[in-house]
Amino acid sequence: FERTRSLQDPCSNCPAGTFCDNNRNQICSPCPPNSFSSAGGQRTCDICRQCKGVFRTRKECSSTSNAECDCTPGFHCLGAGCSMCEQDCKQGQELTKKGCKDCCFGTFNDQKRGICRPWTNCSLDGKSVLVNGTKERDVVCGPSPADLSPGASSVTPPAPAREPGHSPQ
């Protein structure tokens, strides 16, 4: 790496992946192993995070970017930069202090994380329940009861396709 020639700050030309080495007359030196600099002009390289223990490596550290961690199988990340791991549950469950518990009746969870949420109340939108909810799935709301003529199916059939140039009868 050449010595930089900037008149203002000789370190400003040191690119990412290097640091401005005061011990070597401000020459741009490459980051040592297991360290990185993600921006130019840095006077030190940061030590890479190690994904050990409850964490595993999702992306290796390079000279210009830090390592990225995720959690071991059966767990998912929480917090900025995956600072914590939380146990996965099955769909239809939520994590409590005592472990994974089934969603109570009237609630659902369609993911392996998070909490059980109440089924949608179709009647609040003036609609009816088209498909019942389960522990894993929300209800599906359909047309309002008033939209259905007596004896008509709650599932509206598709309108027939009209040919161009023909006005409706």
Epitope: N34, T44, D46, I47, C48, R49, Q50, K52, G53, V54, F55, T72, F75, G79, A80, G81, S83, M84, C85, E86, Q87
Partner: antibody
Framework: QVQLKQSGPGLVQPSQSLSITCTVS????????VHWVRQSPGKGLEWLGA???????DYSAAFMSRVTINKDNSKSQVFFKMNSLRPDDTAIYYC????????????WGQGTSVTVSS | DIQMTQSPASLSASVGETVTITCRAS??????LAWYQQKQGKSPQLLVY???TLADGVPSRFSGSGSGTQYSLKINSLQPEDFGSYYC?????????FGGGTKLEIK
Amino acid sequence: QVQLKQSGPGLVQPSQSLSITCTVSGFSLTNYGVHWVRQSPGKGLEWLGAIWSGGNTDYSAAFMSRVTINKDNSKSQVFFKMNSLRPDDTAIYYCARNPYYTNVMDYWGQGTSVTVSS
Amino acid sequence: DIQMTQSPASLSASVGETVTITCRASGNIGNFLAWYQQKQGKSPQLLVYNGETLADGVPSRFSGSGSGTQYSLKINSLQPEDFGSYYCQHFWSTPWTFGGGTKLEIK
């Protein structure tokens, strides 16, 4: 409740090896890691190494050539061995649990006081 | 290796006072910092992890804060049972080193 109980000798001859057993209860070693730390008047608290739920280990580079950590999940026991002891290895040696949610030491054993002397 | 520098090394305070202990890392440790309390003749006990999260059962008068390389542990309204030694430890990259400790004594 969670407990870590340590057993091991109090006195070790120089150049001999140290073996400590950490017997855990209230949790399973298949789900939790265990660290080993020592505390000496001269050097304070030092992390020595850890064994993880899957059986893989990490060691401090300063002790890698002398320390071995193993475990027996079925007996809920973790085994710590350090070779070629010197007088400056005199310290209290602790095992400590690593929780499942992040890397930290949330429960500690009572400690094993080790003196290296002839 | 990342070095942890803790200050002050010792501290005298009275019951009811507020004290702050600081820990400086030699490099960025991204909030992967724990604080432990140790009473004379006992094993360390976890107080705070990830810089600011209180461990289960730890009184709310304890609080952790900080980012990057600078971290602190604050104890509001000191109680008699709070006197002892305090240590920080990082979990960024091995070896997971500890600070030198702060001995909190009763005035």
